[in-house]
């Protein structure tokens, strides 16, 4: 594996610039990234953005194959952290280092016109065993079996309409099917019922992906318990980083400090969603190209 060490100095990135300009700036900076051999860990150090600081002084390190749970209130910077890992947000200070290819499961699931299978494979070469494993782990077997055309059922324009839960599971399956070194899962269970969520968290995130490096944005204590490391963000800063047992020991302290606190992005929900949608669209178009 090659490790891309990303070092950027005095890069100013505003969400206000609009994503188009930001994307072009990120692409220009991409050309200056140096590749060197390194270990298999994902390393973050000292992040901040000039202007409106979306993330400030974030530090964490997760080894290959570990699960990092990222939590925090609305607007704390959880999705922004994932955007930065994907290179869609550029840090003004600090450095990012990670290995190999990234697969991203967005908070807002999407479906393209095409069959169920095409939506999951999404341009990646077909592997029957891998495909069946993913379908099973994402609890899609029963749903697919009910359609007359099974996984050749057409979705989108002129096709059948899926429920929110089915869309979410197909979106997750798409991300998991892609063979990557790092999986970014942005609140993938938001539209799932709790029974399905528990099954998928166990069978997919904990078992099928056990040897993969995973970053899961979640608010669930059950997920935090199973994570190797936990990162809690508050107003763009790292308020806690450590293990669940360490979190339990600290809880009374930071609970009293932050009682009732909640922060929101400076943009409206519509603005945030439009930015994320455009980000996801651009990221999806790059297909299997290594993002690092």
């Amino acid at each position: 594996l090659t490790t891309t060490e990303v070092v950027m100095e005095n890069v100013t990135a505003f969400w206000e610039e609009g994503f188009g300009e930001l994307f072009e700036k990120a692409k220009q900076n991409n050309n200056n990234r140096k590749t060197s051999n390194g270990d298999d860990s994902l390393f973050f150090s000292n992040f901040s953005l000039l202007g409106t600081p979306v993330l400030k002084d974030i530090n964490f390190k997760i080894e290959r194959g570990q699960l990092l749970a990222v939590a925090g209130s609305t607007g704390a910077g959880k999705t922004s952290l994932l955007m930065m890992i994907m290179g869609e947000l550029e840090p003004s200070e600090g450095k990012i280092k990670h290995s190999g290819r990234i697969s991203f499961c967005p908070q807002f699931s999407w479906i393209m016109p095409g069959t169920i299978k095409e939506n999951i494979i999404f341009g990646v070469s077909y592997d029957e065993y891998r495909y069946r494993s993913v379908i099973k782990a994402c609890q899609l077997e029963e749903d697919i079996s009910k359609f007359p055309e099974k996984d050749n059922t057409v979705l989108g324009e002129g096709g059948i309409t899926l429920s929110g839960g089915q869309r979410a599971r197909i979106s997750l399956a798409r991300a998991v099917y892609k063979d990557a070194d790092l999986y970014l899962l942005d609140s993938p269970f938001g539209y799932l019922d709790v029974l399905t969520e528990k099954e998928i968290f166990e069978s997919c995130v904990c078992k099928l992906m056990a040897n993969k490096t995973r970053i899961l944005v979640t608010s669930k204590m059950e997920h935090l318990k199973k994570a190797d490391k936990i990162l809690i963000l508050h107003e763009g800063s790292s308020y806690f980083y450590g293990t669940f047992s360490e979190l339990q020991n600290l809880q009374p302290d930071f609970s009293s400090k932050l009682m009732g606190c909640d922060s929101f992005d400076q943009f409206s929900a519509e603005r945030r969603n439009s930015i994320l949608t455009e980000t996801l669209h651009r990221f999806s178009l790059e297909g299997d190209a290594p993002v690092s």
Epitope: S73, G164, Y191, V194, S219, K220, E222, Q251
Partner: nanobody
Framework: QVQLQESGGGLVQAGSSLRLACAAT????????MGWYRQAPGKQRGMVAI???????DYADSVKGRFTISRDNAKNTVYLQMNSLKPEDTATYYC?????????????????WGQGTQVTVSS
């Protein structure tokens, strides 16, 4: 201490309606997803309907078009309006909610379940 209490169950004739309610009480800061699940004798518990904090809904295929889930965030209550009931809807109905207690920081949630309310539909 957080509790979920269901109400509204009972014995009804096929084709009639019932409205279930579930109120969350206790030291609650916020509630994310809420939902209704049911379990018939000898069967596994399964989802009936869920509703997100902002009102997005999802239903089991078997109840689509007949059941409607709604919630009142101010009252920390979720409802299930059940129309055109069938004998196969007979089950114990459980309420579920993802709740952040006042003592929890950063809006971290735990899963809570109600004790269940019996719905029996006779033919």
């Amino acid at each position: 201490q957080v509790q979920l209490q269901e109400s509204g169950g009972g014995l009804v004739q096929a084709g009639s309606s019932l409205r279930l309610a579930c109120a969350a009480t206790g030291s609650i800061r916020s509630i994310n997803n809420m939902g209704w699940y049911r379990q018939a004798p000898g069967k596994q518990r399964g989802m009936v309907a869920i509703i997100t904090r902002v009102g997005n809904t999802d239903y089991a295929d078997s109840v689509k078009g007949r059941f409607t889930i709604s919630r009142d965030n101010a009252k920390n209550t979720v409802y299930l309006q059940m129309n055109s009931l069938k004998p196969e809807d007979t089950a114990t109905y459980y309420c579920h909610a993802e709740i952040t207690e006042q003592s929890r920081p950063f809006y971290l949630t735990d899963d809570y379940w109600g004790q269940g309310t019996q719905v029996t539909v006779s033919s």
